[in-house]
């Protein structure tokens, strides 16, 4: 058993059919010795009498607010919440696996340049009795800060029968460099509770794997004299870093027919324009990447060939 | 080339070359096989190759006050992983490909690096640790190590050759 | 699927020599190292040496000047030949796939069902 | 070499219960956090049976009922639910250096 935060706690279940549980022992929070009785969430029964109880968690049943009371008067408040192990494993119920890039992906994160400002988001199918707390540090043996906001609900989805709900958490490190090489990973770290239950879940990367520029901006087409080219310009998104000469990013030049099937023209550039035919009822899309570090590309920006 | 003693080196050649091996190390990273030990690990791997950090001016206001601190950092990174992929790490058991571009990554590797410093003038280097891989399974998961590593600091090596090429040339 | 298989003389006189051949289907010898075990009645495994994809070769430094493993990678066989067998060399010998190197970090995945020799006069 | 020791060397448990086995390294076993330790189950007449590899992942076709933890030196081998298919011997191995080696086994028995 360990303390999530005052007055809360989680205890760690081996769960499997008759399993033992865990003997935990609850001390009420006073300087009273005499007459104090136990009770749990809204029950009036009385669990047990004097400072301590102690108690055998074995179930969701055996969680929830525990409460010593003296004469009527509340003295105070544990909440034991359970973190569930089954076959070597902690459960992972409250979030959904996002399967990308792997499976097991429970959390995601972005970042659009490498100020050290970054968001992670996660799926869940619970609409209730929901809660989330989010930590992050640089390294983990010996950690330098990273501040996160709260998780906020950031979209819902419907899918299938089921509502698919969005959560999302901005961080910012503390003291970002940009320039530097990378060598001790960020690590995200969100506690789940979802009624009597807790779960954790964990991040590692680098801000330089998780870069994902926004699209280029300002995409404009101009024609060329006596020809079916077009001079395709565009300028490096605002949210990149700058300055541009040490932050380069390289693009993609794409001609898309109308319809999917027809054949793509790709023109790859590290300039801000580009020459290319454009037929008719085609768009022309660009997008951006790290010039010298394979992480995604950004988003096309598009714009209609006429 | 660089000439020792604070004057610039050829910041375009440079440009060139370490946009080249961006390009080489990620072009190597998914042949060096099969790997799913990959995504596991630890922290203590990165301990052992040397980083471009942050004092290390290897910023666009560094470079500009004094460009040689990032260049002599550069250049000691370059000399330890070239010393890195010509090692049993790579050389031993399992055999890489006959066209794996590890052979082009190693000798683009030792290109940058005579670049910046020509014959006759010696920045100290960084001792490789002795990472004693015994086994291929430990060879391999070095592999992986070491070429993610390397496109992390060739990224940061090419950043600062672009800049210096665009805004510090003479 | 996946197949090791050996075959040995079974019986073999104090101070002679054991050829065991060991054939395997399912996967090619370029691609995976093999290992020999051997097991004594009613004992527990004892790791013999390993030839790699490449050809190379690790042994036990305790019977290592008594082993030698080899291969035929267009036959798909491997080979062990051990020399100066006493009655303690009785045992159960296994060939053994080593699981991908990128994956399984030296555990065997595949195991034959092994031959049996006994060292006796 | 690298001692690997088993215990305990039997263990009788009923059916429905937890089996716990534990394997303890003379050296540890990990290689830049990857633990080359690996359990196998080995039924009387038939060659061991790799269950799990790399401390905790379960081998393709074993029931999830069998799990692995562990790290460096300590490791433990843990079947839920014991069903009388798992009366087997278990044995430990690591692969982080020469010789590879293995544990003397722990037998497991039905109570």
């Known amino acids: 058993i360990w303390e999530l935060k005052k007055d809360v706690y989680v205890v760690e279940l081996d769960w499997y059919p008759d399993a033992p549980g865990e003997m935990v022992v609850l001390t009420c929070d006073t300087p009273e010795e005499d007459g104090i009785t136990w009770t749990l969430d809204q029950s009036s029964e009385v669990l047990g009498s004097g400072k301590t109880l102690t108690i055998q968690v074995k179930e969701f049943g055996d969680a929830g607010q525990y409460t010593c009371h003296k004469g009527g008067e509340v003295l105070s408040h544990s909440l034991l919440l359970l973190h569930k192990k089954e076959d070597g494993i902690w459960s992972t119920d409250i979030l959904k696996d996002q399967k990308e890039p792997k499976n097991k992906t429970f959390l995601r994160c972005e970042a659009k340049n490498y100020s050290g400002r970054f968001t992670c988001w996660w799926l869940t199918t619970i609409s209730t009795d929901l809660t989330f707390s989010v930590k992050s540090s640089r390294g983990s043996s010996d950690p330098q800060g990273v501040t996160c906001g709260a998780a906020t609900l950031s979209a819902e989805r419907v899918r299938g029968d089921n509502k698919e709900y969005e959560y999302s958490v901005e961080c910012q490190e503390d003291s970002a460099c940009p320039a530097a090489e990378e060598s001790l990973p960020i690590e995200v770290m969100v506690d789940a509770v979802h009624k009597l239950k807790y779960e954790n879940y964990t991040s590692s990367f680098f801000i330089r794997d998780i870069i994902k520029p926004d699209p280029p901006k300002n995409l404009q087409l101009k024609p060329l004299k006596n020809s079916r080219q077009v001079e395709v310009s565009w300028e490096y998104p605002d949210t990149w870093s700058t300055p541009h000469s040490y932050f380069s990013l390289t693009f993609c030049v794409q001609v898309q027919g109308k319809s999917k099937r027809e054949k793509k023209d790709r023109v790859f550039t590290d300039k801000t324009s580009a020459t290319v035919i454009c037929r008719k009822n085609a768009s022309i899309s660009v997008r951006a990447q790290d010039r010298y570090y394979s992480s995604s590309w950004s988003e096309w920006a598009s714009v209609p060939c006429s | 080339r660089a000439v020792p003693g604070g004057s610039s080196p050829a910041w375009t050649q440079c440009q060139q070359l370490s946009q080249k091996l961006c390009t080489l190390a990620w072009s190597a990273h998914p042949l060096v096989g099969h790997m799913d030990l990959r995504e596991e690990g630890d922290e203590e791997t990165t301990n052992d190759v040397p980083h471009i950090q942050c004092g290390d001016g290897c910023d666009p206001q560094g470079l500009r006050d004094n460009s040689q601190f990032c260049l002599q950092r550069i250049h000691q990174g370059l000399i330890f992983y070239e010393k890195l992929l010509g090692s049993d790490i790579f050389t031993g058991e399992p055999s890489l490909l006959p066209d794996s571009p590890v052979g082009q990554l190693h000798a683009s590797l030792l290109g940058l690096s005579q670049l910046l410093q020509p014959e006759g003038h010696h920045w100290e280097t960084q001792q490789i640790p002795s990472l004693s891989p015994s086994q291929p399974w430990q060879r391999l998961l070095l592999r992986f190590k070491i070429l993610r590593s390397l496109q992390a600091f060739v990224a940061v090596a090419a950043r600062v050759f672009a800049h210096g090429a665009a805004t510090l040339s003479p | 699927q996946v197949q090791l298989k050996e075959s040995g003389p079974g019986l073999v006189a104090p101070s002679q020599s054991l050829s065991i051949t060991c054939t395997v289907s399912g996967f090619s010898l370029t691609s995976y190292a093999i290992s020999w075990v051997r097991q004594p009645p009613g004992k527990g495994l004892e790791w013999l040496g390993v030839i790699w994809t490449g050809g190379g070769t690790n042994y036990n430094s305790g019977i290592k000047s008594r082993l030698t493993i080899s291969k035929d990678n267009s036959k798909s066989q491997v080979f062990l030949n051990m020399n100066s067998l006493q009655t303690e060399d009785t045992a159960r010998y296994y060939c053994?796939?080593?699981?991908?190197?990128?994956?399984?970090?030296?555990?065997?995945?595949?195991w034959g069902q092994g031959t049996s020799v006994t060292v006796s006069s | 070499d690298i001692v690997l020791t088993q215990s305990p060397a039997s263990l009788a448990v009923s059916l429905g219960q937890r089996a716990t086995i534990s394997c303890r390294a003379s050296?540890?076993?990990?290689?830049?956090?990857?633990?080359?330790m690996h359990w196998f189950q080995q039924k009387p007449g038939q060659p061991p049976k790799l269950l799990i590899y790399r401390a905790s992942n379960l081998e393709s076709g074993i029931p999830a009922r069998f799990s692995g933890s562990g790290s460096r030196t300590d490791f433990t081998l843990t079947i839920n639910r014991v069903e009388t298919d798992d009366v087997a011997t278990y044995y430990c191995?690591?692969?982080?250096?020469?010789?590879?080696?293995f544990g003397g086994g722990t037998k497991l028995e039905i109570k």
């Open positions: 053994v796939r080593e699981g991908d190197y990128g994956s399984y970090a030296g555990a065997m995945d595949y």
């Open positions: 191995q690591q692969a982080n250096k020469d010789p590879y080696t």
């Open positions: 050296e540890s076993v990990d290689y830049y956090g990857i633990s080359s």
